[in-house]
Interface confidence: medium
């Protein structure tokens, strides 16, 4: 967890996360997009647990198959590459969670879709937000 | 561990060109807003340009703009700055510096610097 | 362009006395995301500035505590607790809201 000397910057870099998975929800569930339907076949792992930032360490193991489902999307969907989008958000997920940090993530039992996914780390970053305000 | 190293600074007369370098390693380069701003000898910091992590965006200090130029490549964990028509009031230790939050930021851009290089100097004198 | 005033310009003080610098911005640096955009740097002699404060009041990595940093809208405070002997050197805020990125003047701590 963040020193309380550091809330404002999590807090930001929360928000910069929040921004990029809106981005990647707004992008794929895009009416124009012809590849949601084979996109909403990809299974993901859901965390059973997400309240704190060492959580999001289920995030970043799931980044590779979210960025293998966006390479089928049409990139004009996008500001960024689905390479670029990933490492960017990656990077935030490291700095957010600690790079040093040894969590072992413990997935649901069910799996979920993308938008599904999405949502659920989108709730989480707002509700971390909410308590960091 | 983070570091930035500048490089490119010299002596140069008046009018002429100079591009800086500034390798960054300990990092992903490529995810954070760059900067440069120098100090004139015995004067405070003044801010010269910002680029953002992917290049969409780049703004310069009112007494660069239209003479200096900020870039970056990412492939190459390097930000420069071109800078041409020199003048004697360029004189200066121009650093190079990383952005303190990663990511976009688009709507709230935080214009926040974590780690500074250790300086290159530029003099412009006939 | 946001116009940043410090002041005292030069500050002695004595070891493990309190110290403090202040800093006025011509605009509001609060964001509607309800930070302040301000940052607050020290540069000792002959090194690069280091980040003490972001956003106001957020100590930067590795900033003792005797440090701290308050304020909001356009009247900023640096406040050091109990000064040390390595805390000499010029300290700078800039605002980090909107480009053109402008800092104040600086403000000189020197033991007395």
């Known amino acids: 967890a963040p020193t309380s000397s550091s809330t404002k910057k999590t807090q930001l870099q929360l928000e910069h996360l929040l921004l990029d998975l809106q981005m990647i929800l707004n992008g794929i569930n895009n009416y124009k997009n012809p590849k949601l339907t084979r996109m909403l076949t990809f299974k993901f792992y859901m965390p059973k647990k997400a309240t704190e930032l060492k959580h999001l360490q289920c995030l970043e193991e799931e980044l590779k198959p979210l960025e293998e489902v966006l390479n089928l999307a049409q990139s004009k969907n996008f500001h960024l590459r689905p390479r670029d989008l990933i490492s960017n958000i990656n990077v935030i997920v490291l700095e957010l969670k600690g790079s040093e940090t040894t969590f072992m993530c413990e997935y649901a039992d069910e799996t979920a879709t993308i938008v599904e996914f999405l949502n659920r780390w989108i709730t989480f970053c707002q509700s971390i937000i909410s308590t960091l305000t | 561990q983070v570091q930035l190293v500048e490089s490119g600074g010299g002596v140069v007369q008046p009018g002429r060109s100079l591009r800086l370098s500034c390798a960054a390693s300990?990092?992903?380069?490529?995810?954070?807003?760059m900067y440069w701003v120098r100090q004139a000898p015995g004067k405070g910091l003044e801010w010269v340009a910002v680029?953002?992590?992917?290049?969409?965006?780049?703004y310069h200090g009112d007494s660069v703009k239209g003479r200096f130029t900020i870039s970056r490549d990412n492939s190459k964990n390097t930000l420069y700055l071109q800078m041409n028509s020199l003048r004697a009031e360029d004189t200066a230790v121009y650093y190079c510096?990383?952005?303190?939050?990663?990511?976009?930021?688009?709507?709230?851009?935080?214009?926040?610097?974590?780690?500074w290089g250790q300086g290159t100097t530029v003099t412009v004198s006939s | 362009d946001i116009v940043m005033t410090q002041s005292p310009l030069s500050l002695p003080v004595t070891p493990g006395e309190p110290a403090s610098i202040s800093c006025r911005s011509s605009?509001?640096?609060?964001?509607?995301?309800?930070?302040?955009?301000l940052d607050w740097f020290l540069q000792k002699p002959g090194q690069s500035p280091q980040p003490l404060i972001y956003?106001?009041?957020d100590r930067a990595s590795g900033v003792p505590d005797r440090f701290s940093g308050s304020g909001s809208g356009t009247d900023f405070t640096l406040k050091i607790s109990r000064v040390e002997a390595e805390d000499v050197g010029v300290y700078y805020c800039?605002?980090?809201?909107?480009?053109?990125?402008?800092f104040g003047g600086g403000t000189k701590v020197e033991i007395k």
């Open positions: 800039m605002q980090a809201l909107q480009t053109p990125l402008t």
């Open positions: 510096a990383k952005g303190a939050v990663a990511g976009t930021g688009r709507d709230y851009y935080y214009y926040g610097m974590d780690v």
């Open positions: 956003l106001g009041s």
């Open positions: 300990g990092f992903t380069f490529s995810s954070y807003g």
């Open positions: 680029i953002w992590y992917d290049g969409s965006n780049k």
């Open positions: 605009q509001s640096l609060l964001h509607s995301n309800g930070f302040n955009y």
